[in-house]
């Protein structure tokens, strides 16, 4: 490549590589690479690989990363996941079986363990593995709000599909609320979209984690693939750095 | 400002001003400023000013402009608007009065006059002037699909408000479809969000352009402020330039 | 668009995204990132000629303007447009961590 | 953020958005744009010091990295981040036209 003077492509590559060295360490707020002396031998644990793969895979309904906020979002986010409370928990008994909805509850103590303060959360996604679907289905996501009321969050038009597919809903604001409140268990409801005229409001889509002898007959969980919250948050110690440097520039 | 050498701020400003001269002409695909010899004397026509103000004002539900596609979206878009067919038109008689919906129909010949080819359309917004609203209302927008079926498009949670406020819905895909099809009149429905359990599904929000002795008792139009489609499209002659230069670079 | 599809398959001399794969072990001498082993970082390179002045023969410039200086900058610069994040796995002591690093992969460039 | 709120009220020497109002008649000698009479175009200016090399004392650099070279470019550059469109009214012959020009107003800048 030449402009007024010849560009040394190799030099540019070396500078870019060195800049990436600084970028990665700075995003992790590490002054030097972490020591590997304590690392257990053998392959990475299954759960860690599953979490890594969940993060790596783009899923239906997740948009490409928007332009980040300059400061806090520059730094790396720790990724954790919290699985839905198993369906034999008594919380599910309070919600009447229905053909148009399924319910998903989460233990807020697990959420707080992963993200100690609401301000640290930068993204929360509800991920559901939808099994094959014969017809197009319009679904809505609700958040449990007070005693028996539900607040609408978002909707999705699901195309028919022969293969299972992960769905993702951005629930950052909701999880941030939950972390601020004192509740022990919080939940979502996935419902068929009900139009004012329509009579057939059955939830046709199968979500992994609920057996479907009948919709609402909530029972066994299919392994790790039941619904979960994928959380991205600034680790506490990194956040303390940030606060102390907030007034600089 | 100084780096290794002092920056001449005035020179930078002059270069930026000259660059803007080129940018504006190039976005309009004008080789030189248009002659003003034929411009009628006196102020701008009212309708033109109204259209300019509609374009200038950001409204509820309209996102900031996304990063544009590099080629076609670099160039200026001509802005036009098409008002909803007046409610005394017989098309409205076919749709039963209901407490949960209002209907808005548009003449596709007017749309085609504004945008001769579907591919030229870059954005279409349905704009509605909502009057004051006492309670929060969750509304849904539908597109007339076939004989008497409606396709869900999007939804909006409207906060209570003492003053009128413009709402905007992105309906680009729908209007592009309409331009491709042969229909004469096409339409939207704005409905209350109906949940599967809920009984009270009344559309509480008043939209300017419909008298509200009873919802659905569609009658007089309040001037130019009835619902309209705001269209942004590449003018035909500019598009021809683009096609001829498509294989360059 | 000056993206990987266009730039990797052409010999474009002006602003474009250029291929660069970083192997953490080979290029940075790092063993501490356990996943991935490396990634396609890429980078932006190439001139954005400043192509407007009062005496320019304008008709020749018109078609190029939106590529070389669409933002009408006083000194246009070839910079990333679309970026993607990179998740990594590393250990802190005995504890494995999964972290997501924003804006690590350059997918396309622009003159800005 | 290096936006108008921060930059217009500070004496920031590094990359920042700078104030620039363009009056179509005075600055460009144009009478043909009927609305608006001018607009706040603004521009980006200021160095993005390159602040990483193998021998850098890293702890001093850490806090600055995300401002001066967040994208790890080989030569970081101060460029627009958030841009806004500008609608204009002009005549073609006797016919008034309203057109929207994308990305005309610089609201914030970044090192990229």
């Amino acid at each position: 490549l030449s402009t007024c003077k010849t560009i040394d492509m190799e030099l540019v590559k070396r500078k870019r590589i060195e800049a990436i060295r600084g970028q990665i360490l700075s995003k992790l707020r590490l002054a030097s690479p972490p020591s590997q002396g304590e690392v257990p031998p053998g392959p990475l644990p299954e759960a860690v690989l599953a979490l890594y793969n969940s993060t790596r895979d783009r899923v239906a309904g997740e948009s490409a990363e928007p332009e980040p906020e300059p400061e806090a979002d520059y730094y790396a986010k720790e990724v954790t996941r919290v699985l839905m409370v198993e369906t034999h928990n008594e919380i599910y008994d309070k919600f009447k079986q229905s053909t148009h909805s399924i319910y998903m509850f989460f233990n807020t103590s697990e959420l707080r363990e992963a993200v100690p303060e609401p301000v640290l959360l930068s993204r929360a996604e509800l991920r559901l593995l939808r099994l094959k679907l014969k017809v197009e289905q319009h679904v809505e996501l609700y958040q449990k709000y007070s005693n028996n009321s539900w607040r609408y969050l978002s909707n999705r038009l699901l195309a028919p599909s022969d293969s299972p597919e992960w769905l993702s809903f951005d629930v950052t604001g909701v999880v941030r609320q939950w972390l601020s409140r004192g509740g022990e268990i919080e939940g979502f409801r996935l419902s068929a979209h009900c139009s004012c005229d329509s009579r057939d409001n059955t939830l046709q889509v199968d979500i992994n984690g609920f057996t479907t002898g009948r919709r609402g007959d909530l029972a066994t969980i299919h392994g790790m693939n039941r619904p979960f919250l994928l959380l991205m948050a600034t680790p506490l110690e990194r956040a303390q750095h940030l606060q102390s440097s907030r007034h600089r520039r | 400002l100084s780096t290794c050498k002092t920056i001449d701020m005035e020179l930078v400003k002059r270069k930026r001003i000259e660059a803007i001269r080129g940018q504006i002409l190039s976005k309009l695909r004008l080789a030189s400023p248009p002659s003003q010899g034929e411009v009628p004397p006196g102020p701008l026509p009212e309708a033109v000013l109204a259209l300019y103000n509609s374009t200038r004002d950001r409204v509820a539900g309209e996102s900031a402009e996304p990063e544009p596609e590099p080629e076609a979206d670099y160039y200026a878009k001509e802005v036009t608007r098409v008002l909803m067919v007046e409610t005394h038109n017989e098309i409205y008689d076919k749709f039963k009065q209901s407490t949960h919906s209002i209907y808005m129909f548009f003449n596709t010949s007017e749309l085609r006059e504004a945008v001769p080819e579907p591919v030229l359309l870059s954005r279409a917004e349905l704009r509605l002037l909502r009057l004051k609203l006492k309670v929060e209302q969750h509304v849904e927008l539908y597109q007339k699909y076939s004989n008497n079926s409606w396709r869900y498009l999007s939804n909006r949670l409207l906060a209570p408000s003492d003053s009128p406020e413009w709402l905007s819905f992105d309906v680009t895909g729908v209007v592009r479809q309409w331009l491709s099809r042969g229909g004469e009149i096409e339409g939207f429905r704005l409905s209350a969000h109906c949940s599967c359990d809920s009984r009270d599904n009344t559309l509480q929000v008043d939209i300017n352009g419909f008298t509200t002795g009873r919802r659905g008792d569609l009658a007089t139009i309040h001037g130019m402020n009835r619902p309209f489609l705001l269209l942004m499209a590449t003018p035909l002659e500019r598009a021809q330039h683009l096609q001829s230069s498509r294989h360059r670079r | 668009a000056l993206d990987t599809n266009y730039c990797f398959s052409s010999t474009e001399k002006n602003c474009c995204v250029r291929q660069l794969y970083i192997d953490f072990r080979k290029d940075l001498g790092w063993k501490w990132i356990h996943e991935p082993k490396g990634y396609h970082a890429n980078f932006c390179l190439g001139p954005c000629p400043y192509i407007w002045s009062l005496d320019t023969q304008y008709s020749k410039v018109l078609a190029l303007y939106n590529q070389h200086n669409p933002g009408a900058s006083a000194a246009p610069c070839c910079v990333p447009q679309a970026l993607e994040p990179l998740p990594i796995v590393y250990y802190v002591g005995r504890k494995p961590k999964v972290e997501q690093l924003s804006n690590m992969i350059v997918r396309s460039c622009k003159c800005s | 953020a290096l936006d108008t709120n921060y930059c217009f009220s500070s004496t920031e020497k590094n990359c920042c958005v700078r104030q620039l109002y363009i009056d179509f008649r005075k600055d460009l000698g144009w009478k043909w744009i009927h609305e608006p009479k001018g607009y706040h175009a603004n521009f980006c200016l200021g160095p993005c010091p390159y602040i990483w090399s193998l021998d850098t004392q890293y702890s001093k650099v850490l806090a600055l990295y995300n401002q001066h070279n967040p994208g790890a470019s080989a030569a970081p550059c101060c460029v627009p981040q958030a841009l806004e469109p500008l609608p204009i009214v002009y005549y073609v012959g006797r016919k008034p036209k309203v057109e929207q020009l994308s990305n005309m107003i610089v609201r914030s800048c970044k090192c990229s």
Epitope: - | L30, A31, S32, P33, P34, S35, Q36, G37, E38, L236, E237, Q240 | L54, D55 | G29, K31, V92, G93, R94
Partner: antibody, heavy 118, light 107 residues
Framework: EVQLVQSGAEVKKPGASVKVSCKAS????????MHWVRQAPGQGLEWMGR????????AYAQKFQGRATLTVDTSTSTAYMELSRLRSDDTAVYYC???????????WGQGTLVTVSS | DIQMTQSPSSLSASVGDRVTITCRAS??????LNWYQQKPGKAVKLLIY???RLHSGVPSRFSGSGSGTDYTLTISSLQPEDFATYFC?????????FGQGTKLEIK
Amino acid sequence: EVQLVQSGAEVKKPGASVKVSCKASGYTFTSYWMHWVRQAPGQGLEWMGRIDPQSGGIAYAQKFQGRATLTVDTSTSTAYMELSRLRSDDTAVYYCARWDYGGYFDVWGQGTLVTVSS
Amino acid sequence: DIQMTQSPSSLSASVGDRVTITCRASQDITNYLNWYQQKPGKAVKLLIYYTSRLHSGVPSRFSGSGSGTDYTLTISSLQPEDFATYFCQQGDTLPWTFGQGTKLEIK
């Protein structure tokens, strides 16, 4: 190639009318206004008027108001200029010219000589 | 109407010469000044529009400059095919008006 082809030379008696045609090709006829300009022997160029083929809108120079009539046939991409009540000083070459909105004439016909003589 | 005064009305020059023709408007025409070339029996050709913009296909030896009321056409090095009559025209205000022409002849 963009072209304007005009009708052939005419000889007319004073008081008569003449109708000159101008056939456009190589571009969208309705996208550009068509202007008429004349040039008397040994003189400069004089603008007569213009027509917008899309809307039919017309403007005349004051001197030709009431005597010149501009028309178009969009089906054949042809513009016409008719001048009535001819006088000897109307002897000139008549040109049609395509107008660009920048205020200039970018394509011209080859000209039609109209001679008015008794 | 805006009056356009062109000078000189004729001039003789040789191949390779640099030639300048001027055009003065009776009021400010804000750069809407165009130059045309006319040869006997041929269609009129646009050379320069908006003071200094070269029309496509026109050799770069032709250039234009000026502002306000005073404008100039320059041919940097005359070629045999440049001997013709040149007209200026204002595109600022209706009615469009032309200069009376400058006839460029071989010396």
